[in-house]
């Protein structure tokens, strides 16, 4: 979801002088960095998370913390080590003066330091409840019982665990890490303190209004009575979950994070580590009517990030704000006027709204899916959530224009049957961060560790781009898009699929000399074409149109502009078969689409020809979309003809395997 250079404020303090008494100086040329929340009112100066390099042991963390204290004391500063992290991230939490940051950044093993910041419950009005009658009546939806094999961890406020709706379903752990409430006259009223968490526990597993009625829950208190917490408190909570998981391994775990703060490198890193330990994390996209990539943990790619929609499948408006949106959102879910347990009394119900409620729905759906198929990986679960979602029902006009193409038009739904989806070839579309406008700017889109990158495309609103290519990075293929001179920037779009036992490679043909255009095909035995990309060095491709229809008997071929290098993604996997589907429109059109038919999955989406009036191509569910410049501005009809090229695949192997199971 977010690129390494995500949107947050970074202050790099260079190592200006050799620190006295430093036995182990940092490696030559490395500079530890300092990060802080870009939203000033949310900053908590004076408390810092010192993150150490990945391989640092607990003893080294403790030694580094002691060294900081000793060196600070020599300068007349008091420091307090509040917590030493281990299990998820190596490091420590320290209370100290900001004057000591430069000193701290020079310590051995230090990777980066992040100033602590606030996180907030994502329900509105989360403590100004509109009490409904003690019970809502009659014909309400009754989802099936489920989720009994799954444990859901809730990081939230305190909760009223003996509420009739959730009694016996929630184990309140002894974990508590919350800041003091704001204001000297704040009165802690238990029912208000428990409001947010109680409601969400009810949405996940409540007997009446819960999604996964069979799921058991464990609650950790990281938000105070005002619904406010800290990044550091959330980190310590995530570490607590990891340690619990190690001490007593149970079945599948879902962690619900119905909170949001500003972009936090350390919170995202902790979520990544926990996800890679096999835990499913679900979080609120945020209620700021803003790009979710600017918030954490919403911006963590490994987390399932959920936006909120209402009963009419429209994005939720919350006062002057509303649900967050953008490429960091995985899907939307109901988040307006959601009925759930109210902490006002042991049998009361209330409606609350927000992306917290939406995330709770998805956590419940995830619990049901994992209960039915406990071996599902995070990647498999995410793909299923996307696959079973209601498609194209959200009115995108609510989102800012530049975010519409990036925001998934998906509303979460329970699968019609929790079994029997195994035969499907699942794919999803992953957008990169925007490259920025500089001439050589690039954008990179990545798939999850256990997904295969089957194709790569690019998109630029100005049309000024130099295409895209798949390249190896850290032993894995990534999709890189290239900006062009005068361009406002590009996006890379990866098509990420679940393809067990796949062996994929990229075949490249350099720009052709002949006027026929460039071609490349999958020549290895048993390899099939899953995607085509083209990349060019020239600033503006001419209007040359290659023949868009492939010669008969050569479906495994990518065709492109003669001045472009063409890249074919070729994969071998048991039972994998693919076909090329094209839709050409002779007259100029702003959008051309081609869809794969039932039973086939879109793996590749590209445009022919790759001329400069084509803004790019991208996959939306099972449809390949090619966008062109507004023809009224190009004025030319000769180069108006555009063809959308879809590559549609299916796996006979997956289908057979699923039939054998049934």
């Amino acid at each position: 979801q977010e690129d390494e250079d995500g949107d947050y404020e970074e202050l790099v303090l260079a190592l200006r002088s050799e620190e006295d008494g430093l036995a182990e100086a940092p490696e030559h040329g490395t500079t530890a960095t300092f990060h802080r929340c870009a939203k000033d009112p949310w900053r908590l100066p004076g408390t810092y998370v010192v993150v150490l390099k990945e391989e640092t042991h607990l003893s080294q963390s403790e030694r580094t913390a002691r060294r900081l204290q000793a060196q600070a004391a020599r300068r007349g500063y008091l420091t307090k080590i509040l917590h030493v992290f281990h299990g998820l991230l190596p490091g420590f939490l320290v209370k100290m003066s900001g004057d000591l940051l430069e000193l701290a950044l020079k310590l051995p093993h230090v990777d980066y330091i992040e100033e602590d910041s606030s996180v907030f419950a994502q329900s509105i009005p989360w403590n100004l409840e509109r009490i409904t009658p003690p019970r809502y009546r009659a014909d309400e939806y009754q989802p099936p019982d489920g989720g009994s094999l799954v444990e859901v961890y809730l990081l939230d406020t305190s909760i009223q665990s003996d509420h009739r709706e959730i009694e016996g379903r929630v184990m309140v752990t002894d974990f508590e890490n919350v800041p003091e409430e704001d204001g000297t006259r704040f009165h802690r009223q238990a029912s208000k303190c428990d409001s947010h968490g109680t409601h969400l526990a009810g949405v996940v597993s409540g007997r009446d209004a819960g999604v996964a009625k069979g799921a058991s829950m464990r609650s950790l208190r990281v938000l105070n009575c005002q619904g406010k917490g800290t990044v550091s408190g959330t980190l310590i909570g995530l570490e607590f979950i990891r340690k619990s998981q190690l001490v007593q391994p149970v079945g599948p775990l879902v962690v619900l994070l119905p909170l949001a703060g500003g972009y936090s490198r350390v919170l995202n890193a902790a979520c990544q580590r926990l996800a890679r330990a096999g835990v499913v994390l679900v979080t609120a996209a945020g209620n700021f009517r803003d790009d979710a990539c600017l918030y954490s943990p919403a911006s963590a790619p490994e987390v399932i990030t959920v936006g909120a929609t209402n009963a009419q499948d429209q994005p939720v408006t919350l006062g002057t704000l509303g649900t967050n949106f953008g490429r960091c959102v995985d899907l939307f879910a109901p988040g307006e006027d959601i009925i759930g347990a109210s902490s006002d009394c042991s049998t009361c119900f209330v409606s609350q709204s927000g992306t917290s409620q939406a995330a709770a729905h998805v956590a419940g759906i995830a619990a049901m899916m994992l209960s039915a198929e406990p071996e599902l990986t995070l990647a498999e679960l995410r793909q299923r959530l996307i696959h079973f979602s209601a498609k194209d029902v959200i009115n995108e006009a609510w989102f800012p224009e530049d975010q519409r193409v990036l925001t998934p038009n998906l509303v979460a739904a329970l699968p019609p049957s929790t079994h029997g989806a195994g035969w499907q070839l699942f794919c999803r579309t992953v957008w990169s961060a925007h490259s920025g406008p500089t001439r050589m700017a690039t954008a990179v889109a990545r798939c999850a560790p256990d997904e295969e990158l089957l194709s790569c495309s690019s998109f630029s609103r100005s049309g000024k781009r130099r295409g895209e290519r798949m390249e190896a990075q850290g032993g894995k293929l990534v999709c890189r898009a290239h900006n062009a001179f005068g361009g406002e920037g590009v996006y890379a779009i990866a098509r990420c699929c679940l393809l067990p036992q796949a062996n994929c490679s990229v075949h490249t043909a350099p720009p052709a000399e002949a006027s026929m255009g460039t071609r490349v095909h999958c020549h290895q035995q048993g390899h099939v074409l899953t995607g085509c990309s083209s990349h060019w060095e020239v600033e503006d491709l001419g209007t040359h149109k290659p023949p868009v229809l492939r010669p008969r008997g050569q479906p495994n071929q990518c065709v492109g502009h003669r001045e472009a290098s063409i890249h074919a993604s070729c994969c071998h996997a048991p039972g994998l078969e693919c076909k090329v589907k094209e839709h050409g429109i002779p007259a100029p059109q702003e959008q051309v689409t081609v869809a794969c038919e039932e039973g086939w999955t879109l793996t590749g989406c590209s445009a022919l020809p790759g001329t400069s009036h084509v803004l790019g191509a991208y996959a939306v569910d099972n449809t390949c979309v090619v966008r062109s410049r507004d023809v009224s501005t190009t004025g030319s009809t000769s180069e108006g003809a555009v063809t959308a090229v879809a590559i549609c695949c299916r796996s006979r192997h997956l289908a057979q395997a699923s039939q054998e199971l049934q």
Epitope: R135, E140, Q160, S161, D162, R164, E167, G168, D208
Partner: antibody, heavy 115, light 107 residues
Framework: QVQLVQSGAEVKKPGASVKVSCKAS????????ISWVRQAPGQGLEWMGW????????NYAQKLQGRGTMTTDPSTSTAYMELRSLRSDDTAVYYC????????WGQGTTVTVSS | DIQMTQSPSSLSASVGDRVTITCRAS??????LNWYQQKPGKAPKLLIY???SRQSGVPSRFSGSGSGTDFTLTISSLQPEDFATYYC?????????FGQGTKVEIK
């Protein structure tokens, strides 16, 4: 295993008070409240009220008309039900049960109100 | 308050018989219904919760069904130890209320 152990039988005069205790063990007491149910001789079950171990919140049946008080002591995992101004029709077996769902019951405490 | 009406109030049956007890709520209670068995001098024992879920340790001959206002407890093959009084209870709303009981006696 889950257990609810109640105090012993009581014989009271009309107008007196009785306080029955119920000690819970084998589970996290704050995850459930305690329901109190009584059964007059040869009669059916009558719910009296519910009390929270977590916050001490209560729900009372209207019929108690302020004569009953339910409390908890989380430190000892014990719930109490006090009934004042006893009448002869309060003669019954008093049960404590776990939560609203009443999935586990105490053995019962016989309260006899007789002059 | 929600009224719970059980029928019959008593029945005589033989070992091996299939026995059905019904419970009607005065208003919709979704599936918030429990069934209890009580033997003389003993505390009630939960058999069925959520209208149809069997409590752990309860023999499979006991089953529950229904939703909304009409519910049924079925004993598929009556055993000697099943002669007792059976109560339904709604906990959809406070006050939680019980049916008046059905006494199952030996024919």
């Amino acid at each position: 295993q889950v257990q609810l152990v109640q105090s012993g039988a009581e014989v009271k005069k009309p107008g007196a008070s009785v306080k029955v205790s119920c000690k819970a063990s084998g589970y996290t007491v704050t995850s459930y409240g305690i329901s109190w149910v009584r059964q007059a001789p040869g009669q059916g079950l009558e719910w009296m009220g519910w009390v929270s171990f977590y916050q001490g919140n209560t729900n009372y049946a209207q019929k108690l008309q302020g004569r009953g008080t339910m409390t908890t002591d989380p430190s000892t995992s014990t719930a109490y039900m006090e009934l004042r101004s006893l009448r002869s029709d309060d003669t019954a077996v008093y049960y404590c049960a776990r939560g609203f769902g009443m999935d586990r019951w105490g053995q019962g405490t016989t309260v006899t109100v007789s002059s | 308050d929600i009224q719970m009406t059980q029928s019959p109030s008593s029945l005589s049956a033989s070992v091996g018989d299939r026995v059905t007890i019904t419970c009607r709520a005065s208003q919709n209670i979704n599936s918030w219904l429990n069934w209890y068995q009580q033997k003389p001098g003993k505390a009630p024992k939960l058999l069925i919760y959520g209208a149809s879920s069997r409590q752990s340790g309860v023999p499979s001959r006991f089953s529950g069904s229904g939703s909304g206002t009409d519910f049924t407890l079925t004993i598929s093959s009556l055993q000697p130890e099943d002669f007792a009084t059976y109560y339904c209870q709604q906990w959809f709303d406070v006050p939680t209320t019980f049916g008046q009981g059905t006494k199952v006696e030996i024919k």
